[in-house]
């Protein structure tokens, strides 16, 4: 079968890298400079993906690949196969259309990406707050406070470590 | 605010050269990211993409005109500049600079045009 | 380099109605897609970026769509101040124009 088909079509047994070039008699030629057949019986090769302004050439393109690119430093990839480029901003940030802005007070960030996101809200669970929160971080909500017995701490001292071998005191 | 003011533009005789300007507010062309360039428009016709500069100085010419155009920045007055030699009628057009991407989302586009200057090659 | 080719060159249309126009790239340029208007006089605008993300301050009657060598504008219901020339714009590699189309009043 595959024998037929190449009698058919000359242009089938020109494999990745190469193309089936009309101009000179259907002969299989490299693909130029600057471009790729990423399969074979290809009757023109495509051209690169040119990684430009802010974007930087994170693979090469080859005879048989396309190349691939990802953001400068201080940017974060956005969209199908990083075709736009994000401005990173610190923990305890978001990015607004005038730049970096501090989360406001309730509300944190913990990555160079996204949104402030609110603390949580321990009350909801029936739980207090053990650790509070701030702009790069959340709170950590700890026991009830009916958990606790009267006149303890809200904050519980870590317990021992524990030995292998040994039985908890 | 970001802003792009061209200069540089008028009558200009067939062989001889033209420097052109643009000048940019708001923004740093030297700042990570930022990525400038020139477009070209002949008069009743379609846009022509001629060349751009990066912030870090890396160049991207048009293949057809890559011989006769220099593109480069002065980072002390953050202005941008299109040398284009050997000039000839078909280069009569109004010429943009244009700023890749938008305020903080940055890609293969042009968020912001300057008002664009015209060049008339003729003698 | 990649053509773009634009269609139609020119259209009459009114108030009201839906447009579409359409890009053809001589390859896949799949995302790197953006869509500019322009005025007589004025600088492009830019409406639609990465083939479908309306750019800041552009009306919901524009949207972007397609795919590979395929693309569309489309214009859900032409407003007076819409009638301009329309390009679509690669950046897949380097840069280049479509030729434009002239959305005209009938």
């Known amino acids: 079968f595959e024998r037929t088909r190449s009698l058919q079509d000359p242009c089938s047994n020109c494999p990745a890298g190469t193309f089936c070039d009309n101009n000179r008699n259907q002969i299989c030629s490299p693909c130029p400079p600057n471009s790729f057949s990423s399969a074979g019986g290809q009757r023109t090769c495509d051209i690169c993906r040119q990684c430009k302004g802010v974007f930087r050439t994170r693979k090469e393109c080859s005879s048989t690949s396309n190349a691939e690119c990802d953001c400068t430093p201080g940017f974060h990839c956005l969209g199908a196969g990083c075709s736009m480029c994000e401005q990173d901003c610190k923990q305890g940030q978001e990015l607004t259309k005038k730049g970096c802005k501090d989360c406001c007070f309730g509300t944190f960030n913990d990555q160079k990406r996204g949104i402030c996101r609110p603390w949580t809200n321990c009350s909801l669970d029936g739980k207090s707050v053990l650790v509070n929160g701030t702009k790069e971080r959340d709170v950590v909500c700890g026991p009830s406070p009916a958990d606790l017995s009267p006149g303890a701490s809200s904050v519980t001292p870590p317990a021992p470590a524990r030995e292998p071998g040994h039985s908890p005191q | 605010e970001v802003q792009l003011v061209e200069s540089g533009g008028g009558l200009v005789q067939p062989g001889g050269s033209l420097r052109l300007s643009c000048a940019a507010s708001?923004?740093?062309?030297?700042?990570?990211?930022?990525?400038v360039g020139w477009i070209r428009q002949a008069p009743g016709k379609g846009l022509e993409w001629l060349a751009l500069?990066?912030?870090?100085?890396?160049?991207s010419y048009s293949t057809s005109l890559k011989s006769r155009l220099t593109i480069s920045r002065d980072n002390s007055k953050n202005t941008l500049y299109l040398q284009l030699n050997s000039l000839r009628a078909e280069d009569t057009a109004v010429y943009y600079c244009?700023?890749?991407?938008?305020?903080?989302?940055?890609?293969?586009?042009?968020?912001?045009w300057g008002q664009g200057t015209l060049v008339t090659v003729s003698s | 380099d990649i053509q773009l080719t634009q269609s139609p060159s020119s259209l009459s249309a009114s108030v009201g109605d839906r447009v579409t126009i359409t890009c053809r790239a001589s390859?896949?340029?799949?995302?790197?897609l953006a869509w500019y208007q322009q005025k007589p006089g004025k600088a492009p605008k830019l409406l639609i970026y990465?083939?479908?993300n309306r750019a800041t301050g552009i009306p919901s009657r524009f949207s972007g769509s397609g795919s590979g060598t395929d693309f569309t504008l489309t214009i859900s219901s032409l407003q007076p101040e819409d009638f301009a020339t329309y390009y679509c714009?690669?950046?897949?590699?380097?840069?280049?124009f479509g030729q434009g189309t002239k959305v005209e009043i009938k």
């Open positions: 990465d083939a479908s």
């Open positions: 500069i990066d912030w870090a100085g890396d160049k």
């Open positions: 708001g923004f740093s062309l030297s700042t990570g990211g930022v990525a």
């Open positions: 390859q896949g340029v799949s995302p790197y």
């Open positions: 714009q690669q950046g897949y590699s380097t840069w280049t």
């Open positions: 244009a700023r890749g991407g938008s305020d903080t989302v940055l890609g293969d586009w042009f968020a912001y």
